[in-house]
């Protein structure tokens, strides 16, 4: 089955923006929202934002979590507000964080 093609006039969503790429803004607009977690020298760095171009998020959002990085994507206004990306933890989850699974 072919990957879904982007629409000519794609819907843009408002997303929460938290992280290095956000500047002074706390939101951004794009075709997909994301919530990510990366491990930098053993420290958890959480980011949220948007992919403004469909192709930009296409591969990233399909990448399964690894021990050093996880990304959760969604489509809908502010849909990443309550999403916390999590690393695979062999059946255990970190205390104080939410589990989120894409259907």
């Amino acid at each position: 089955m072919e990957d879904e093609k982007p629409k000519v006039n794609p819907k843009l969503y408002m997303c929460v923006c938290e992280g290095l790429s956000c500047g002074n803004e706390d939101h951004c607009e794009g075709q997909q929202c994301f919530s990510s977690l990366s491990i930098n020298d053993g420290f958890h760095v959480y980011q949220k934002g948007c992919f403004q171009v469909y192709e930009q998020g296409k591969m990233t959002c399909k990448t399964p979590p690894s021990p050093g990085q996880a990304v959760e994507c969604c489509q809908g206004d502010w849909c990443n507000r309550n999403i916390t990306a999590q690393l695979p933890t062999k059946g255990k989850s970190f205390p104080g964080t939410q589990n989120f699974h894409l259907e």
């Epitope: 938290e18 491990i39 020298d41 053993g42 420290f43 958890h44 933890t89 062999k90 104080g96």
Partner: antibody
Framework: EVQLVESGGGLVQPGGSLRLSCAAS????????MYWIRQAPGKGLEWISS????????YYPDSVKGRFTISRDNSKNTVYLQMNSLRAEDTAVYYC???????????WGQGTLVTVSS | DIQMTQSPSSLSASVGDRVTITCKAS??????LNWFQQKPGKAPKLLIY???SLQTGIPSRFSGSGSGTDFTLTISSLQPEDFATYYC????????FGQGTKVEIK
Amino acid sequence: EVQLVESGGGLVQPGGSLRLSCAASGFTFSNYYMYWIRQAPGKGLEWISSINTDGGSTYYPDSVKGRFTISRDNSKNTVYLQMNSLRAEDTAVYYCAKSTPNIPLAYWGQGTLVTVSS
Amino acid sequence: DIQMTQSPSSLSASVGDRVTITCKASQNIYKYLNWFQQKPGKAPKLLIYYSNSLQTGIPSRFSGSGSGTDFTLTISSLQPEDFATYYCFQYSSGPTFGQGTKVEIK
């Protein structure tokens, strides 16, 4: 109550080795990343190592890479720091610390002093 | 590595004073910054995480602000137990501490 208790410090000659231990209690040890931070006498703080929950990923700054090794034993709720090829500049109080995923270095042990001198 | 520059390196203040300590990062670290308090012979104690979140059990006279490269720790009304050394710490990349700010009694 979270408790982190370091041990194993002492006097060692330059070029020598030492293994520090940090015994943890009051939380589910195997769920948390652990860290070592040091502080030379009268100086500031320096992060020197991190380890993930299962011990499979370890991290070091260049200043100790190749000489220090962090490890953990989740069955004993203990994290270790093996220090080899010690130098005078490694003289410091060594602290063990833990994070929660959202709060880096939330808890610290009381520290153990390592003195490297001939 | 990201350099963290704290200022001032030391300051003298009186009980009841408003005290401000700044930390400047050599590059953008967003809000990935903590503040610690350390007293002589003791381990550092976390005061503020994620730039402006107050750690549980820390008095509300402590507050943090900033994003990007410029950060501030403020003690709204200095208390006798606040005389200590304060460190900022960034974990955006290559974790590093500031050099410390010693708060002394005037």
